[in-house]
C-alpha cells in the first residue's frame, strides 16, 4: 500500500492489499477501505458504474458480472483500486458487442475475462474462418482484445473472443466490426 510523508494526504488503503483478487462464483466479496476521510466505493466494468457509500463493500454471493474494478476514494480525491475476477466456468467472458473502429486506429473488442487463468485468449473468425493475415491484436484480460491499426477491409468482419479449455475452444458471443473510413 502507498506510503506518504506525514502531513501529506495519502490514498486510502484497501484490504485485501493486492491489485487483483480472484474469487469463485457464489463466494463472498468483502473489500474494506480504510481512510478517515472515506467518501465512496466505485465499481466499473464495461459501461456499468455503481457506487457505494459504505466503507466495506460486501457482495454475499458473487456472480460473474461482479467482475471489475473496485475503487475507493477519499475526501482529498485520492483513490486506490483492486480488480476482482469472479471465476464462473459457465460465463468466461463479459461482453459489450458494440464494435466500431476508425481506419488506421486501434479498436477494442470488449470481452474482459472473468478468469484470467486461461490459455490462448484470442480472437477467432466466425464459422471457423481465419482472421485477415495482417490482423494483429493485443490481449488484456481486464479490458478485452485490442485490434491494432484497423483496415478498411475489416469492415463487417465477424469475430469471437476465444479461450482454450480442456482442448476445446470456448467462444464469446459474436462481434461485427464496423469500420469508419479515415477521410
Amino acid at each position: 500500500q502507498p506510503s506518504v510523508s506525514p502531513g501529506e494526504p495519502s490514498p486510502p488503503s484497501i484490504h485485501p492489499g493486492k491489485s487483483d483478487l480472484i474469487v469463485r462464483v457464489g463466494d463472498e466479496i468483502r473489500l474494506l477501505c480504510t481512510d478517515p476521510g472515506f467518501v465512496k466505493w466505485t465499481f466499473e466494468i464495461l459501461d456499468e458504474t455503481n457506487e457505494n457509500k459504505q466503507n466495506e463493500w460486501i457482495t454475499e454471493k458473487a456472480e460473474a458480472t461482479n467482475t471489475g474494478k473496485y475503487t475507493c476514494t477519499n475526501k482529498h480525491g485520492l483513490s486506490n483500486s483492486i480488480y476482482v475476477f469472479v471465476r464462473d466456468p459457465a460465463k468466461l467472458f463479459l461482453v459489450d458487442r458494440s464494435l466500431y473502429g476508425k481506419e488506421d486506429n486501434d479498436t477494442l473488442v470488449r470481452c474482459p475475462l472473468t478468469d484470467p487463468e486461461v490459455t490462448n485468449y484470442s480472437l477467432k473468425g466466425c464459422q471457423g474462418k481465419p482472421l485477415p493475415k495482417d490482423l494483429r491484436f493485443i490481449p488484456d484480460p481486464k479490458a478485452g482484445i485490442m485490434i491494432k491499426s484497423v483496415k478498411r477491409a475489416y469492415h463487417r468482419l465477424c469475430l469471437h473472443c476465444s479461450v482454450d479449455q480442456e482442448g476445446k475452444s470456448v467462444l464469446s458471443e459474436k462481434f461485427i466490426l464496423k469500420v469508419r473510413p479515415a477521410f
Epitope: 487483483d20 487463468e117 484470442s122 480472437l123 477467432k124 490481449p139 484480460p141
Partner: nanobody
C-alpha cells in the same frame, strides 16, 4: 534495456523432459509479457509459448499444446518452460523473448515483430 539469459538446454531422449529457464535483468520484469520461440535446423523461427505480465494468461502453439507448460516467478525475474514428452521434432535452439505490448495473430501466435528483447538461445536436442 532488458537482458535475457537462457539455461537448461541439453540432450535428451524422446519421451523425456527438460526445463528451460530465462532470467531477466534490467527493467521491471513483471511489466513484460514473456515467451519462448524456437528455431529448428533449416527452419524459420517459430512461436512456442507465452505468458502475459499477470502470470496467469498463457499461450501455446498447437505443436506444443498439452506437452509444454510456461510459468513465471516475478520474485526471481525468471520465466520457465517445462517440456515433457519431448519428440525429435522439438530439436531446436530455444530463444527467450520479452515484450511490453505483445501482439498476436490468428491462432494466438505471438508475432515476433512485437518482441522487444531476445535472449541468445539455448540448444535442445531430442534423440530418437
Amino acid at each position: 534495456q532488458v537482458q535475457l539469459v537462457e539455461s537448461g538446454g541439453g540432450l535428451v531422449q524422446a519421451g523425456g523432459s527438460l526445463r528451460l529457464s530465462c532470467v531477466a535483468s534490467g527493467r521491471t520484469f513483471s511489466s513484460y509479457a514473456m515467451g519462448w520461440f524456437r528455431q529448428g535446423p533449416g527452419k524459420e523461427r517459430e512461436f512456442a509459448a507465452a505468458i502475459l505480465s499477470n502470470g496467469l494468461t498463457t499461450y501455446y502453439a498447437d505443436s506444443v499444446k498439452g506437452r509444454f507448460t510456461i510459468s513465471r516467478d516475478n520474485a526471481k525475474d525468471t520465466v520457465y518452460l517445462q517440456m515433457n514428452s519431448l519428440k525429435p521434432e522439438d530439436t531446436a535452439n530455444y530463444y527467450c523473448a520479452a515484450a511490453f505490448t505483445p501482439e498476436f495473430r490468428d491462432g494466438g501466435i505471438w508475432d515476433d515483430a512485437s518482441v522487444d528483447y531476445w535472449g541468445q538461445g539455448t540448444q535442445v536436442t531430442v534423440s530418437s
